[in-house]
Protein backbone atom coordinates (compact mmCIF):
# COMPACT_ATOMS: atom_id res chain seq x y z
CA UNK A 1 0.00 0.00 0.00
CA UNK A 2 1.23 3.50 -0.76
CA UNK A 3 -0.10 7.05 -0.57
CA UNK A 4 -1.17 8.59 -3.88
CA UNK A 5 -2.09 11.91 -2.25
CA UNK A 6 -3.37 13.03 1.13
CA UNK A 7 -5.86 10.47 2.50
CA UNK A 8 -5.85 8.49 -0.78
CA UNK A 9 -4.05 5.14 -0.82
CA UNK A 10 -3.36 2.54 -3.50
CA UNK A 11 -3.50 -1.14 -2.56
CA UNK A 12 -1.57 -3.36 -4.97
CA UNK A 13 -3.34 -6.70 -5.45
CA UNK A 14 -2.43 -9.95 -7.15
CA UNK A 15 -5.67 -10.60 -9.01
CA UNK A 16 -6.68 -14.25 -9.37
CA UNK A 17 -9.62 -16.38 -8.19
CA UNK A 18 -9.73 -16.82 -4.40
CA UNK A 19 -6.65 -14.63 -3.90
CA UNK A 20 -6.20 -13.83 -0.19
CA UNK A 21 -5.72 -10.14 -0.87
CA UNK A 22 -3.73 -7.78 1.33
CA UNK A 23 -4.06 -6.93 5.00
CA UNK A 24 -4.12 -3.14 5.40
CA UNK A 25 -3.84 -1.21 8.66
CA UNK A 26 -5.94 1.97 8.79
CA UNK A 27 -5.19 4.61 11.42
CA UNK A 28 -7.70 7.25 12.42
CA UNK A 29 -6.13 10.72 12.17
CA UNK A 30 -7.18 11.96 15.58
CA UNK A 31 -5.76 12.51 19.06
CA UNK A 32 -8.76 10.53 20.38
CA UNK A 33 -8.02 7.04 21.66
CA UNK A 34 -11.36 5.51 22.69
CA UNK A 35 -14.87 5.13 21.30
CA UNK A 36 -13.78 5.22 17.67
CA UNK A 37 -15.81 3.24 15.11
CA UNK A 38 -15.28 2.66 11.39
CA UNK A 39 -17.61 2.49 8.39
CA UNK A 40 -17.10 1.89 4.67
CA UNK A 41 -18.65 4.25 2.10
CA UNK A 42 -22.34 4.92 2.73
CA UNK A 43 -22.97 1.69 4.67
CA UNK A 44 -24.54 2.07 8.09
CA UNK A 45 -22.89 -1.20 9.14
CA UNK A 46 -20.05 -0.66 11.59
CA UNK A 47 -16.93 -2.38 10.31
CA UNK A 48 -15.06 -2.29 13.59
CA UNK A 49 -13.62 -0.11 16.31
CA UNK A 50 -10.34 1.26 17.63
CA UNK A 51 -7.88 3.93 16.56
CA UNK A 52 -6.29 1.41 14.19
CA UNK A 53 -8.19 -1.17 12.19
CA UNK A 54 -6.76 -4.09 10.19
CA UNK A 55 -8.79 -4.91 7.09
CA UNK A 56 -8.51 -7.53 4.39
CA UNK A 57 -8.62 -6.03 0.89
CA UNK A 58 -9.20 -8.56 -1.87
CA UNK A 59 -11.70 -7.05 -4.34
CA UNK A 60 -13.36 -3.77 -5.34
CA UNK A 61 -16.02 -4.25 -2.65
CA UNK A 62 -13.22 -3.71 -0.11
CA UNK A 63 -12.02 -0.47 -1.73
CA UNK A 64 -13.69 2.87 -1.10
CA UNK A 65 -13.86 5.50 1.61
CA UNK A 66 -13.20 4.28 5.13
CA UNK A 67 -14.37 6.76 7.76
CA UNK A 68 -13.65 6.80 11.47
CA UNK A 69 -16.25 8.37 13.79
CA UNK A 70 -16.72 9.17 17.44
CA UNK A 71 -20.14 9.92 18.88
CA UNK A 72 -21.64 10.74 15.48
CA UNK A 73 -18.75 13.06 14.51
CA UNK A 74 -16.51 12.23 11.53
CA UNK A 75 -12.84 12.19 12.58
CA UNK A 76 -11.04 11.31 9.33
CA UNK A 77 -11.29 9.51 5.99
CA UNK A 78 -9.04 7.15 4.03
CA UNK A 79 -9.88 6.41 0.41
CA UNK A 80 -8.53 3.04 -0.77
CA UNK A 81 -8.03 2.41 -4.51
CA UNK A 82 -7.02 -0.91 -6.07
CA UNK A 83 -4.17 -1.52 -8.52
CA UNK A 84 -4.61 -4.97 -10.09
CA UNK A 85 -1.76 -7.23 -11.12
CA UNK A 86 -2.77 -10.25 -13.24
CA UNK A 87 -0.15 -12.88 -14.10
CA UNK A 88 2.55 -10.42 -13.03
CA UNK A 89 1.28 -7.63 -15.31
CA UNK A 90 -0.37 -4.44 -14.05
CA UNK A 91 -3.83 -3.92 -15.51
CA UNK A 92 -4.37 -1.49 -18.40
CA UNK A 93 -8.17 -1.39 -18.48
CA UNK A 94 -8.66 2.37 -18.45
CA UNK A 95 -6.73 3.48 -21.54
CA UNK A 96 -6.98 2.19 -25.08
CA UNK A 97 -3.97 0.67 -26.81
CA UNK A 98 -3.28 3.04 -29.73
CA UNK A 99 -1.08 0.35 -31.37
CA UNK A 100 1.03 3.08 -33.00
CA UNK A 101 3.97 2.95 -33.43
CA UNK A 102 3.79 -0.44 -31.70
CA UNK A 103 1.45 -2.56 -29.56
CA UNK A 104 0.92 -1.50 -25.94
CA UNK A 105 1.27 2.19 -26.84
CA UNK A 106 -1.11 3.95 -24.46
CA UNK A 107 0.52 7.41 -24.43
CA UNK A 108 1.58 9.24 -27.58
CA UNK A 109 3.63 12.42 -27.50
CA UNK A 110 4.69 15.02 -30.07
CA UNK A 111 6.74 18.21 -30.10
CA UNK A 112 6.47 20.97 -32.71
CA UNK A 113 10.05 22.12 -32.11
CA UNK A 114 13.11 21.76 -29.85
CA UNK A 115 11.97 24.24 -27.17
CA UNK A 116 11.28 21.46 -24.64
CA UNK A 117 7.53 21.87 -24.99
CA UNK A 118 5.56 18.76 -25.94
CA UNK A 119 2.03 17.40 -25.93
CA UNK A 120 0.94 13.90 -24.94
CA UNK A 121 -2.46 12.34 -25.53
CA UNK A 122 -4.31 9.11 -24.79
CA UNK A 123 -7.66 7.48 -25.55
CA UNK A 124 -10.39 5.88 -23.42
CA UNK A 125 -13.96 4.70 -23.87
CA UNK A 126 -14.78 5.71 -20.28
CA UNK A 127 -16.85 8.88 -19.95
CA UNK A 128 -17.41 9.34 -16.19
CA UNK A 129 -15.72 8.95 -12.78
CA UNK A 130 -12.33 9.38 -14.42
CA UNK A 131 -9.36 11.48 -13.28
CA UNK A 132 -5.81 11.83 -14.60
CA UNK A 133 -2.67 13.24 -13.07
CA UNK A 134 0.52 13.74 -15.09
CA UNK A 135 4.14 14.01 -13.93
CA UNK A 136 7.26 14.26 -16.04
CA UNK A 137 11.02 14.61 -15.69
CA UNK A 138 14.17 14.30 -17.75
CA UNK A 139 15.93 11.19 -16.53
CA UNK A 140 14.79 9.13 -13.58
CA UNK A 141 17.76 8.60 -11.26
CA UNK A 142 18.62 12.33 -10.91
CA UNK A 143 15.49 13.82 -12.50
CA UNK A 144 15.47 17.30 -14.01
CA UNK A 145 12.24 19.26 -13.92
CA UNK A 146 9.47 19.14 -16.47
CA UNK A 147 6.22 20.98 -15.70
CA UNK A 148 2.93 19.55 -16.97
CA UNK A 149 -0.47 21.19 -16.94
CA UNK A 150 -3.77 19.50 -16.17
CA UNK A 151 -4.99 16.81 -18.54
CA UNK A 152 -8.06 17.96 -20.47
CA UNK A 153 -10.64 16.29 -22.68
CA UNK A 154 -9.48 17.35 -26.15
CA UNK A 155 -11.73 15.36 -28.52
CA UNK A 156 -14.70 13.00 -28.67
CA UNK A 157 -15.23 10.58 -31.54
CA UNK A 158 -17.76 7.90 -32.40
CA UNK A 159 -16.09 4.59 -33.28
CA UNK A 160 -18.76 2.11 -34.33
CA UNK A 161 -21.01 1.60 -31.32
CA UNK A 162 -18.51 3.20 -28.93
CA UNK A 163 -17.67 6.77 -28.07
CA UNK A 164 -13.96 7.39 -27.74
CA UNK A 165 -12.53 10.21 -25.62
CA UNK A 166 -9.14 11.78 -26.22
CA UNK A 167 -7.34 13.50 -23.35
CA UNK A 168 -4.21 15.57 -23.75
CA UNK A 169 -1.66 17.40 -21.63
CA UNK A 170 1.02 19.98 -22.39
CA UNK A 171 4.41 19.81 -20.70
CA UNK A 172 7.45 22.10 -20.73
CA UNK A 173 10.99 21.21 -19.76
CA UNK A 174 12.03 23.75 -17.11
CA UNK A 175 15.57 24.35 -18.36
CA UNK A 176 15.45 23.27 -21.98
CA UNK A 177 18.50 23.65 -24.21
CA UNK A 178 17.21 23.33 -27.79
CA UNK A 179 20.62 22.92 -29.43
CA UNK A 180 21.99 20.37 -26.96
CA UNK A 181 22.39 16.68 -27.76
CA UNK A 182 19.96 14.77 -25.53
CA UNK A 183 21.53 11.99 -23.44
CA UNK A 184 18.72 11.36 -20.95
CA UNK A 185 15.17 10.70 -22.09
CA UNK A 186 12.04 12.52 -20.98
CA UNK A 187 9.88 10.32 -18.74
CA UNK A 188 6.11 10.88 -18.65
CA UNK A 189 3.95 9.22 -15.99
CA UNK A 190 0.15 9.30 -16.05
CA UNK A 191 -1.90 8.21 -13.01
CA UNK A 192 -5.40 7.17 -14.06
CA UNK A 193 -8.26 6.57 -11.61
CA UNK A 194 -11.64 5.21 -12.70
CA UNK A 195 -14.04 4.85 -9.76
CA UNK A 196 -11.92 2.75 -7.34
CA UNK A 197 -9.44 1.43 -9.93
CA UNK A 198 -5.94 2.90 -10.12
CA UNK A 199 -3.59 2.40 -13.08
CA UNK A 200 -0.40 4.06 -14.19
CA UNK A 201 1.05 4.50 -17.66
CA UNK A 202 4.51 5.64 -18.69
CA UNK A 203 6.32 6.78 -21.80
CA UNK A 204 10.00 7.49 -22.32
CA UNK A 205 11.42 9.41 -25.30
CA UNK A 206 13.90 11.94 -26.59
CA UNK A 207 12.42 15.18 -27.88
CA UNK A 208 14.28 14.60 -31.18
CA UNK A 209 12.29 11.39 -31.72
CA UNK A 210 8.87 12.96 -31.19
CA UNK A 211 9.41 16.04 -33.36
CA UNK A 212 6.59 16.69 -35.81
CA UNK A 213 6.77 20.15 -37.37
CA UNK A 214 3.62 22.12 -38.13
CA UNK A 215 2.79 22.26 -41.85
CA UNK A 216 4.61 24.88 -43.96
CA UNK A 217 2.77 28.22 -44.03
CA UNK A 218 1.88 30.72 -46.76
CA UNK A 219 1.82 28.10 -49.51
CA UNK A 220 1.50 29.99 -52.82
CA UNK A 221 1.55 29.24 -56.55
CA UNK A 222 3.04 31.45 -59.23
CA UNK A 223 2.37 30.36 -62.84
CA UNK A 224 5.41 30.48 -65.12
CA UNK A 225 4.83 32.23 -68.47
CA UNK A 226 4.16 30.06 -71.52
CA UNK A 227 4.36 26.88 -69.43
CA UNK A 228 2.28 24.34 -67.55
CA UNK A 229 4.77 24.72 -64.74
CA UNK A 230 4.21 26.71 -61.57
CA UNK A 231 6.56 27.93 -58.93
CA UNK A 232 5.38 26.77 -55.50
CA UNK A 233 6.67 28.71 -52.51
CA UNK A 234 6.12 28.42 -48.77
CA UNK A 235 7.63 29.46 -45.46
CA UNK A 236 8.81 27.70 -42.32
CA UNK A 237 5.96 27.31 -39.80
CA UNK A 238 5.92 29.94 -37.05
CA UNK A 239 6.25 27.27 -34.38
CA UNK A 240 9.54 25.85 -35.72
CA UNK A 241 12.77 26.46 -33.79
CA UNK A 242 15.01 29.36 -34.77
CA UNK A 243 17.46 30.20 -36.26
CA UNK A 244 16.37 28.30 -39.36
CA UNK A 245 19.98 28.20 -40.54
CA UNK A 246 20.67 25.85 -37.61
CA UNK A 247 17.25 24.21 -37.14
CA UNK A 248 16.71 23.40 -40.80
CA UNK A 249 13.79 21.63 -42.45
CA UNK A 250 13.54 19.58 -45.62
CA UNK A 251 10.36 19.51 -47.69
CA UNK A 252 8.34 17.16 -49.82
CA UNK A 253 6.24 18.68 -52.62
CA UNK A 254 3.47 16.51 -54.06
CA UNK A 255 1.17 16.99 -57.03
CA UNK A 256 -1.96 14.88 -56.57
CA UNK A 257 -4.72 14.47 -59.15
CA UNK A 258 -8.40 14.50 -58.18
CA UNK A 259 -8.48 10.70 -58.13
CA UNK A 260 -6.46 8.94 -55.45
CA UNK A 261 -5.49 6.38 -58.10
CA UNK A 262 -3.67 8.94 -60.23
CA UNK A 263 0.11 8.87 -60.04
CA UNK A 264 1.56 11.30 -57.51
CA UNK A 265 4.53 13.41 -58.54
CA UNK A 266 6.89 14.09 -55.63
CA UNK A 267 9.85 16.43 -55.32
CA UNK A 268 12.15 16.70 -52.27
CA UNK A 269 13.97 19.93 -51.57
CA UNK A 270 15.71 21.83 -48.80
CA UNK A 271 14.62 25.15 -50.32
CA UNK A 272 11.33 26.95 -49.67
CA UNK A 273 10.24 26.83 -53.29
CA UNK A 274 10.02 24.32 -56.14
CA UNK A 275 8.90 24.20 -59.77
CA UNK A 276 6.30 21.57 -60.64
CA UNK A 277 3.78 20.79 -63.37
CA UNK A 278 0.26 21.72 -62.31
CA UNK A 279 -2.33 19.41 -63.89
CA UNK A 280 -5.97 20.42 -64.20
CA UNK A 281 -8.02 19.60 -61.07
CA UNK A 282 -4.86 18.60 -59.22
CA UNK A 283 -3.68 19.99 -55.91
CA UNK A 284 -0.21 20.77 -54.67
CA UNK A 285 0.79 19.78 -51.14
CA UNK A 286 3.93 20.44 -49.15
CA UNK A 287 5.07 18.90 -45.87
CA UNK A 288 8.16 19.37 -43.71
CA UNK A 289 10.61 17.24 -41.76
CA UNK A 290 13.72 17.97 -39.71
CA UNK A 291 16.53 18.09 -42.23
CA UNK A 292 19.13 16.29 -40.13
CA UNK A 293 17.07 13.80 -38.12
CA UNK A 294 14.39 11.52 -39.52
CA UNK A 295 11.52 12.17 -37.14
CA UNK A 296 7.90 12.56 -38.29
CA UNK A 297 6.79 14.50 -41.33
CA UNK A 298 4.36 17.36 -40.75
CA UNK A 299 0.79 17.20 -41.99
CA UNK A 300 0.34 18.47 -45.55
CA UNK A 301 -0.35 22.08 -46.47
CA UNK A 302 -2.34 22.12 -49.73
CA UNK A 303 -3.53 24.49 -52.48
CA UNK A 304 -5.57 23.68 -55.62
CA UNK A 305 -3.83 23.99 -59.01
CA UNK A 306 -6.68 26.00 -60.49
Amino acid sequence: IWELKKDVYVVELDWYPDAPGEMVVLTCDTPEEDGITWTLDQSSEVLGSGKTLTIQVKEFGDAGQYTCHKGGEVLSHSLLLLHKKEDGIWSTDILKDQKEPKNKTFLRCEAKNYSGRFTCWWLTTISTDLTFSVKSSRGSSDPQGVTCGAATLSAERVRGDNKEYEYSVECQEDSACPAAEESLPIEVMVDAVHKLKYENYTSSFFIRDIIKPDPPKNLQLKPLKNSRQVEVSWEYPDTWSTPHSYFSLTFCVQVQGKSKREKKDRVFTDKTSATVICRKNASISVRAQDRYYSSSWSEWASVPCS
Partner: nanobody, 114 residues
Framework: EVQLVESGGGLVQPGGSLRLSCAAS????????MYWVRQAPGKGLEWVST???????AYADFVKGRFTFSKDNAKNTLYLQMNSLKPEDTALYYC????????RGQGTQVTVSS
Protein backbone atom coordinates in the same frame (compact mmCIF):
# COMPACT_ATOMS: atom_id res chain seq x y z
CA GLU B 1 -35.99 -16.69 14.13
CA VAL B 2 -32.23 -15.89 14.27
CA GLN B 3 -30.22 -18.57 16.06
CA LEU B 4 -26.46 -18.50 16.71
CA VAL B 5 -24.69 -21.35 18.52
CA GLU B 6 -21.01 -20.95 19.42
CA SER B 7 -18.65 -23.84 20.24
CA GLY B 8 -14.96 -24.76 20.39
CA GLY B 9 -13.88 -22.87 23.51
CA GLY B 10 -11.80 -24.38 26.27
CA LEU B 11 -8.72 -24.09 28.47
CA VAL B 12 -5.46 -23.56 26.61
CA GLN B 13 -1.90 -22.63 27.56
CA PRO B 14 -0.37 -19.30 26.49
CA GLY B 15 0.88 -19.59 22.90
CA GLY B 16 -1.70 -22.28 22.13
CA SER B 17 -4.51 -22.33 19.56
CA LEU B 18 -8.28 -22.80 19.44
CA ARG B 19 -10.82 -22.81 16.64
CA LEU B 20 -14.23 -21.41 17.53
CA SER B 21 -17.31 -22.21 15.44
CA CYS B 22 -20.68 -20.51 15.17
CA ALA B 23 -23.63 -22.31 13.56
CA ALA B 24 -26.20 -19.84 12.22
CA SER B 25 -29.83 -20.36 11.21
CA UNK B 26 -33.06 -18.46 10.65
CA UNK B 27 -31.68 -15.74 8.33
CA UNK B 28 -29.87 -15.16 4.99
CA UNK B 29 -26.41 -15.84 6.37
CA UNK B 30 -24.35 -15.42 3.17
CA UNK B 31 -25.22 -11.76 2.53
CA UNK B 32 -24.95 -10.49 6.11
CA UNK B 33 -22.05 -8.79 7.83
CA MET B 34 -21.13 -11.02 10.81
CA TYR B 35 -19.07 -10.32 13.91
CA TRP B 36 -17.15 -11.91 16.76
CA VAL B 37 -17.26 -10.00 20.02
CA ARG B 38 -15.95 -10.96 23.47
CA GLN B 39 -16.51 -10.15 27.10
CA ALA B 40 -13.66 -10.51 29.58
CA PRO B 41 -14.52 -11.06 33.28
CA GLY B 42 -15.87 -7.81 34.77
CA LYS B 43 -15.61 -5.92 31.46
CA GLY B 44 -18.00 -4.78 28.72
CA LEU B 45 -18.41 -6.29 25.24
CA GLU B 46 -15.39 -5.79 22.99
CA TRP B 47 -15.39 -6.10 19.18
CA VAL B 48 -12.92 -8.69 17.84
CA SER B 49 -13.52 -9.17 14.10
CA THR B 50 -15.95 -8.66 11.19
CA UNK B 51 -16.57 -10.66 8.03
CA UNK B 52 -18.35 -9.09 5.05
CA UNK B 53 -20.59 -10.93 2.56
CA UNK B 54 -17.65 -11.22 0.12
CA UNK B 55 -15.56 -12.95 2.81
CA UNK B 56 -13.23 -10.00 3.47
CA UNK B 57 -12.41 -9.41 7.11
CA ALA B 58 -11.49 -6.71 9.60
CA TYR B 59 -9.74 -7.12 12.94
CA ALA B 60 -9.27 -5.19 16.17
CA ASP B 61 -5.78 -3.86 16.88
CA PHE B 62 -5.15 -6.35 19.69
CA VAL B 63 -5.55 -9.28 17.25
CA LYS B 64 -2.27 -8.31 15.47
CA GLY B 65 -2.39 -11.14 12.93
CA ARG B 66 -3.11 -13.86 15.48
CA PHE B 67 -6.78 -14.56 14.60
CA THR B 68 -8.44 -15.47 11.30
CA PHE B 69 -12.19 -15.07 10.72
CA SER B 70 -13.68 -17.25 7.97
CA LYS B 71 -17.04 -18.66 6.93
CA ASP B 72 -18.59 -21.56 5.06
CA ASN B 73 -21.79 -20.36 3.36
CA ALA B 74 -22.81 -23.91 2.43
CA LYS B 75 -22.75 -24.92 6.11
CA ASN B 76 -24.00 -21.58 7.47
CA THR B 77 -21.03 -21.64 9.84
CA LEU B 78 -18.51 -19.02 11.00
CA TYR B 79 -15.05 -19.83 12.30
CA LEU B 80 -12.51 -17.93 14.39
CA GLN B 81 -9.07 -19.50 14.28
CA MET B 82 -7.14 -18.19 17.29
CA ASN B 83 -3.36 -18.65 17.41
CA SER B 84 -0.62 -17.39 19.79
CA LEU B 85 -3.21 -17.00 22.54
CA LYS B 86 -2.41 -14.75 25.51
CA PRO B 87 -3.87 -14.66 29.04
CA GLU B 88 -5.57 -11.35 28.14
CA ASP B 89 -7.59 -13.22 25.46
CA THR B 90 -9.48 -14.97 28.28
CA ALA B 91 -13.16 -14.09 27.71
CA LEU B 92 -16.56 -15.33 26.67
CA TYR B 93 -16.64 -15.22 22.84
CA TYR B 94 -19.86 -14.56 20.94
CA CYS B 95 -20.74 -14.47 17.26
CA UNK B 96 -23.22 -11.76 16.38
CA UNK B 97 -25.22 -10.30 13.50
CA UNK B 98 -24.35 -6.74 14.56
CA UNK B 99 -21.32 -4.83 15.76
CA UNK B 100 -22.88 -4.04 19.13
CA UNK B 101 -23.51 -7.72 19.82
CA UNK B 102 -27.21 -7.21 20.52
CA UNK B 103 -28.14 -10.34 18.53
CA ARG B 104 -25.73 -13.06 19.64
CA GLY B 105 -25.52 -16.63 20.84
CA GLN B 106 -24.90 -17.94 24.34
CA GLY B 107 -21.12 -17.70 23.84
CA THR B 108 -18.20 -20.07 24.27
CA GLN B 109 -15.63 -19.64 27.05
CA VAL B 110 -11.95 -19.27 26.19
CA THR B 111 -9.49 -19.48 29.10
CA VAL B 112 -5.76 -18.95 28.50
CA SER B 113 -3.72 -19.97 31.52
CA SER B 114 -0.66 -21.98 32.43
Amino acid sequence: EVQLVESGGGLVQPGGSLRLSCAASGFAFSNRWMYWVRQAPGKGLEWVSTIKPNGSTAYADFVKGRFTFSKDNAKNTLYLQMNSLKPEDTALYYCSTDYAGTVRGQGTQVTVSS
